[in-house]
């Protein structure tokens, strides 16, 4: 199976966006890009800011196919990858080469996936085998997490209340949300 380096036991292979070849709008929305959602106590450092939303890390995109055994998605997909160091957004421009990356002297900051979205993927198989479908998860946005010097490297501390979110960073699913309020989410879930 392809992309072994990116797969764990949850088999989070990246789906094809054949139905929607453009990058999903939610990934281009400034409200979800380059910020940590929700409030909380900011870390103590020389550039301390009262607004957690000012903390930023880079969200990169790259393209690849989904494979599952001999089956492969018809088109390559664009996946969001959380990368780079975290720091106050005003010192951490998205445009590479514009300013210096901010380095905290005390706590260690990590850019990690914040929200995921799920998608059913149609995979085409050789030899006349019937198309198969898989459900996979995509990173929808990134956020900064803080690791203090007093904690083990594996224990990442959230800026705010993100840790209380459900598994995989998904919000609890509504049964009857208004269409208007969720139009963007509806339009790009696949």
């Amino acid at each position: 199976q392809g992309w072994q380096a990116f797969k764990n036991d949850a088999t989070e292979i990246i789906p094809e966006l054949g139905e929607y070849p453009e990058p999903p709008p939610e990934l281009e929305n400034n409200k979800t890009m380059n910020r940590a959602e929700n409030g909380g106590r900011p870390p103590h450092h020389p550039f301390e800011t009262k607004d957690v939303s000012e903390y930023s890390c880079r969200e990169l995109h790259f393209t690849r196919y989904v494979t599952d055994g001999p089956c492969r998605s018809a088109k390559p997909v664009t996946e969001l990858v959380c990368s780079g160091q975290c720091g106050p957004a005003r010192l951490l421009p998205n445009a590479i080469g514009r300013g210096k990356w901010w380095r905290p002297s005390g706590p260690d900051f990590r850019c990690i996936p914040d929200r995921y979205r799920a998608q059913r993927v149609q995979l085409l198989c050789p030899g006349g085998e019937a198309p198969r479908a898989r459900k996979v998860r995509l990173v929808a946005s990134c956020k900064c997490k803080r690791l203090t010097r007093f904690h083990n490297q594996s224990e990442l501390k959230d800026f705010g209340t993100e840790a209380a979110r459900p598994q995989k960073g998904r919000k609890p699913r509504p049964r009857a949300r208004s269409a208007k309020a969720n139009q963007a989410e509806l339009e790009n879930a696949y």
Epitope: D9, A10, T11, G18, E19, Y20, R117, A118, Q119, R120, Q122, R132, A133, R134, K135, P166, Q167, K168, R170, R173, R175, A179, N182, Q183, E185, L186, E187, N188, A189, Y190
Partner: antibody
Framework: QVQLQQPGAELVKPGASVKLSCKAS????????MHWVKQRPGQGLEWIGM????????NYNEKFKSKATLTVDKSSSTAYMQLSSLTSEDSAVYYC???????????WGQGTLVTVSA | SIVMTQTPKFLLVSAGDRVTITCKAS??????VAWYQQKPGQSPKLLIY???NRCTGVPDRFTGSGYGTDFTFTISTVQAEDLAVYFC?????????FGGGTKLEIK
């Protein structure tokens, strides 16, 4: 509010075909897979297949591949399932359901009871 | 196809009791399991997704857990309105399959 509307019942003769409808409202119809699920009286749930309204691409449970044909009409935001060569085994309630984020079948129609009888 | 084996088939309990339903997948499905409640004469309703995430509006007495092949659905304190059939479903690969259902009856 997301709604999937299905007719209440269909009475059909053995050997005939029936085309079930599922009219969607309250969300962007073309953005989500639509699923069809069968439930025989007093029994469990069986997934028949799914269709993506945007592309028309579909995926079937092999068991129903020769029985069901899924289509959509984007202009009316309606999904259809045609069942052919009906027998008493096909008497069941048929539900349409959509994903709304692919986290499970979040929204279901009320179901159409298909009765196959001479 | 992935087979979901759900037990027990029937549960007769009193209001206030704790109820546990289990589902075993024939192969690993990660945490891609959903739980549904179907009340008499109604369509199924999604309660839990990703094995443990409760849908908005679903009372917190309903919980789910598990990963891989073994999954559990629990009602901590059964209430009269919980009379229904409960189904598990693997949401990992097609054909998406359901457990046989557990009929919960209240004494």
């Amino acid at each position: 509010q997301v709604q999937l509307q299905q007719p209440g019942a269909e009475l059909v003769k053995p050997g005939a075909s029936v085309k079930l409808s599922c009219k969607a409202s309250g969300y962007t119809f073309t953005s989500y897979w639509m699923h069809w699920v069968k439930q025989r009286p007093g029994q469990g749930l069986e997934w028949i297949g799914m269709i993506h309204p945007n592309s028309g691409s579909s995926n079937y449970n092999e068991k129903f591949k020769s029985k069901a044909t899924l289509t959509v009409d984007k202009s009316s935001s309606t999904a259809y399932m045609q069942l052919s060569s009906l027998t008493s085994e096909d008497s069941a309630v048929y539900y349409c359901a959509n994903d709304y984020d692919d986290e499970g079948f979040a929204y279901w129609g009320q179901g159409t009871l298909v009765t196959v009888s001479a | 196809s992935i087979v979901m084996t759900q037990t027990p088939k029937f549960l007769l309990v009193s209001a206030g009791d704790r109820v546990t339903i289990t589902c075993k997948a024939s192969q690993s499905v990660s945490n891609d399991v959903a739980w549904y409640q179907q009340k008499p004469g109604q369509s199924p309703k999604l309660l839990i997704y990703y094995a443990s995430n409760r849908c908005t509006g679903v009372p917190d007495r309903f919980t789910g857990s598990g990963y891989g092949t073994d999954f559990t659905f629990t009602i901590s304190t059964v209430q009269a309105e919980d009379l229904a059939v409960y189904f598990c479903q693997q949401d990992y690969s097609s054909p998406w399959t359901f457990g046989g259902g557990t009929k919960l009856e209240i004494k």
